[in-house]
Interface confidence: medium
């Protein structure tokens, strides 16, 4: 097991704090444009999946969703926030890489039903989906935190 994996739980609060601080830089831009509050993209169903048996797969898939689909599109909506979004993407990639390296902590398999729904809604909402997904990024961080804290306790 890699040394970073042994210290992963200690590094966790700092990693999540970094994500939150970085999101603060762009939060207003996206949340002020996310006006479809009748729709919640990241529902409690996703959190249930994160905390379930196949949580790792769901977390990995959501990290990929944000790094590969949401952030690249979000970057096209505002030139003045590209640096912050790039940093956010790199932080998520770092988290994903750590999870992959420390695979003994995270058993990954099985496709996710909740994420299929999230992606369908995201696509259907078109540009509004970008503001929605980015506007709810704070919810995403909280869900990751709950998942990782749960893994740490096991």
């Amino acid at each position: 097991l890699e040394p970073t994996c042994l210290h992963f739980s200690e590094l966790l609060p700092a990693r999540l704090r970094e994500l939150r601080v970085k999101f603060e830089e762009i939060k207003d831009y996206f949340q002020s444009r996310d006006d479809e509050l009748n729709i919640q993209l990241l529902s409690s169903e996703l959190l249930d999946e994160f905390k379930g048996t196949f949580g790792c797969q769901s977390v990995s898939e959501m990290l990929r969703f944000y790094t590969d689909e949401v952030l690249p599109r979000a970057m096209q909506t505002s030139t003045s926030h590209q640096q912050s979004m790039g940093d956010l993407g790199n932080m998520l990639l770092g988290l994903k890489a750590t999870m992959r390296r420390c695979h003994r902590f995270f058993t990954c398999e099985k496709r996710s039903k909740a994420i299929k729904q999230i992606k369908e809604t995201f696509e259907k909402m078109d540009e509004n989906g970008i503001y929605k997904a980015m506007g709810e990024f704070d919810i995403f961080i909280n869900y990751i935190e709950e998942y990782l804290l749960m893994r740490r306790r096991k």
Epitope: D28, Q31, L37
Partner: nanobody, 115 residues
């Protein structure tokens, strides 16, 4: 338990003005977006206006130039000044606030514009 307490509203003539207030029971909202939705009879709840902690505002096209949203972070309160009211502005108005995470809603307040 987080609560949003709304006040204002009532009956007003076409072309008149009203001011709605929404006070949050905790200052968490001074760091987050707050705003207003409305729901007319037999219609879906629709967006009216929002304001971020750094005063970025966003308005529905139907209220632009007539409604003004503002906030007082010290009081954790958001306001909606409604001028040049029309009959189609008649609805129950709900304030909302983004928490961490999720959305909190006020109890709603009736605004009736009579011609």
């Amino acid at each position: 338990q987080v609560q949003l307490q709304q006040s204002g509203g009532g009956l007003v003539q076409t072309g008149g003005s009203l001011r709605l207030s929404c006070a949050a029971s905790t200052n968490i909202f001074s760091r987050n977006t707050m705003g207003w939705y409305r729901q007319a009879p037999a219609k879906q709840r629709e967006f009216v206006a929002s304001i971020t902690r750094s005063d970025i505002t966003n308005y529905a096209d139907s209220v632009k130039g007539r409604f003004t949203i503002s906030r007082d972070n010290a009081k954790s309160t958001v306001y909606l000044q409604m001028d040049s009211l029309k009959a189609e502005d008649t609805a129950v108005y709900y304030c909302y606030a983004r928490g961490r995470p999720g959305i909190y809603w006020g109890q709603g307040t009736q605004v009736t514009v009579s011609s």
